[in-house]
């Protein structure tokens, strides 16, 4: 009988398609958006009208397409009305305010900036870490990594003085340099003197 050969060994199928060998011949099963014997041809979905609604412009992409919507419409097919704050584009707890038919403004929480509040403001340029402390940025605050003999949020407390920390902030602990970093979240656990 004839020798069986695996026609898929040469990886003839392109663009992520699946190869199978049938009677010593390869057969490619294409992913959506590709065509041809080896799935080498990108289907231009934009040749078929009606993909993008409400006057949206069709943009062909490898294996897919994208609709660029006219002002006032949104969604994959430009089939939805655009409402600036629904859903809110503001992140990090920012509050969205509609400023026009198609415009919005994000009111950011303290510590964040950017048109959608996407950036955490670096608080270290204005830091006040004392006694050789090194600043580490937080959210609308900063923390200080203290050298071994100092502790507290701002490295103002002498470790050797025990628990004589600044009022309502910190409890002195003998912590190694690399661990001596006080985060704001700890505040709730500190007792009043």
């Amino acid at each position: 009988g004839s020798q069986w050969t695996d026609a898929c060994l040469s990886h003839p199928c392109a663009n992520g398609s699946t190869c199978t060998t049938v009677a010593n011949q390869f057969s490619c099963k294409c992913l959506t958006g590709f065509t041809g014997q080896k799935c080498e041809t990108d289907v231009n979905e934009c040749d078929i009208p009606g993909h993008c609604q409400h006057g949206g412009t069709c943009l062909n992409l490898p294996g897919s397409y994208q609709c660029q919507c006219l002002q006032g419409f949104t969604g994959q097919y430009c089939d939805s009305l655009y409402v600036p704050c629904a859903p809110s584009p503001c992140v990090n707890g920012g509050t969205c305010r509609q400023t026009g038919d198609f415009t919005f403004e994000c009111n950011c929480l303290p510590g964040f900036e950017g048109s959608t509040c996407e950036r955490n403001i670096d608080d270290c340029p204005n830091h006040r870490c004392q006694n050789g402390g090194v600043c580490v940025d937080g959210v609308n605050t900063y923390n200080c990594r203290c050298p071994p003999q100092w502790t507290g949020q701002f490295c103002t407390e002498d470790v050797d003085e025990g628990n004589s920390g600044l009022n309502d902030i910190f409890e002195a602990q003998k912590i190694e340099w690399h661990e001596n970093l006080y985060f704001q979240g700890h505040h709730h656990h500190h007792h009043h003197h």
């Epitope: 303290p110 608080d123 340029p125 204005n126 830091h127 006040r128 870490c129 004392q130 006694n131 050789g132 402390g133 090194v134 609308n140 605050t141 900063y142 050298p147 949020q153 701002f154 103002t156 600044l166 009022n167 309502d168 902030i169 505040h187 003197h193």
Partner: antibody, heavy 120, light 107 residues
């Protein structure tokens, strides 16, 4: 005993320049943040500029009102802090104090002050 | 910048009176607050740091309290040498900011 002594104040015309000095003694200069604070006659205290310590690479911060006009610097070999003031305005008229940031988030030592008068 | 609202701007009191001065900050300063005393023609003098810690050499009739955004300086029994102007200052971050001052005058 910690001591800070300012000098260099005087009368200068608007647009002019002046360099203030602050000679310090009684502590290791490079270990401390140093600040300039000013006070117009009959008014409150206004922070002007700061230079952090050696551990913080002697980094510098300015108030918005003097940024790009004033320059803070220090000479550790002379234990002296400086404030170079350029493009002076009448509103810069004040007593200028040099102070030490004592590692407590507070200014624990102050000089006697030097008067700067900007007038034509 | 952190805003400092100090009140009252002036207070008339007698020797032996208890005097209270308040300072409110526009954001949490984590007890990084100092109080200073200034007499006419003199440099400011540090009284309290860390909101409640008494600076060395300062009489115990001066005390500080508070946390977050609200702070208080108390003179328990006013002495003749205490008639002066008092300033609060936040040390949490630059730019350092001062309260407008409170003048303690003789009644």
């Amino acid at each position: 005993e910690v001591q800070l002594v300012e000098s260099g104040g005087g009368l200068v015309q608007p647009g002019g320049s002046l360099k203030l000095s602050c000679a310090v003694s009684g502590f290791t200069f490079s270990d401390f943040y140093m600040e300039w604070v000013r006070q117009a006659s009959g008014k409150g205290l206004e922070w002007v500029a700061a230079q952090r310590n050696k551990a913080n690479d002697f980094s510098i911060v300015y108030s918005a009102s003097v940024k790009d006009r004033f320059t803070i610097s220090r000479d550790d070999s002379k234990s002296t802090l400086y404030l170079q003031m350029n493009s002076l305005k009448t509103e810069d008229t004040a007593v200028y104090y040099c102070s030490r940031d004592g590692g407590k988030l507070a200014l624990d030592a102050w000089g006697q002050g030097t008067l700067v008068t900007v007038s034509s | 910048d952190i805003q400092m609202t100090q009140s009252p701007s002036s207070v008339s009191a007698s020797v032996g009176d208890r005097v209270t001065i308040t300072c409110q900050t526009s954001e949490d300063i984590y007890s990084g607050l100092a109080w200073y005393q200034q007499k006419p023609g003199k440099s400011p003098k540090l009284l309290i740091y860390g909101a409640s810690r008494l600076q060395d050499g300062v009489p115990s009739r001066f005390s500080g309290s508070g946390s977050g955004t609200d702070y208080t300086l108390t003179i328990s029994s006013l002495q003749p040498e205490d008639f002066a102007t008092y300033y609060c200052q936040q040390g949490f971050k630059y730019p350092l900011t001062f309260g407008g001052g409170t003048k303690v005058e003789i009644k």
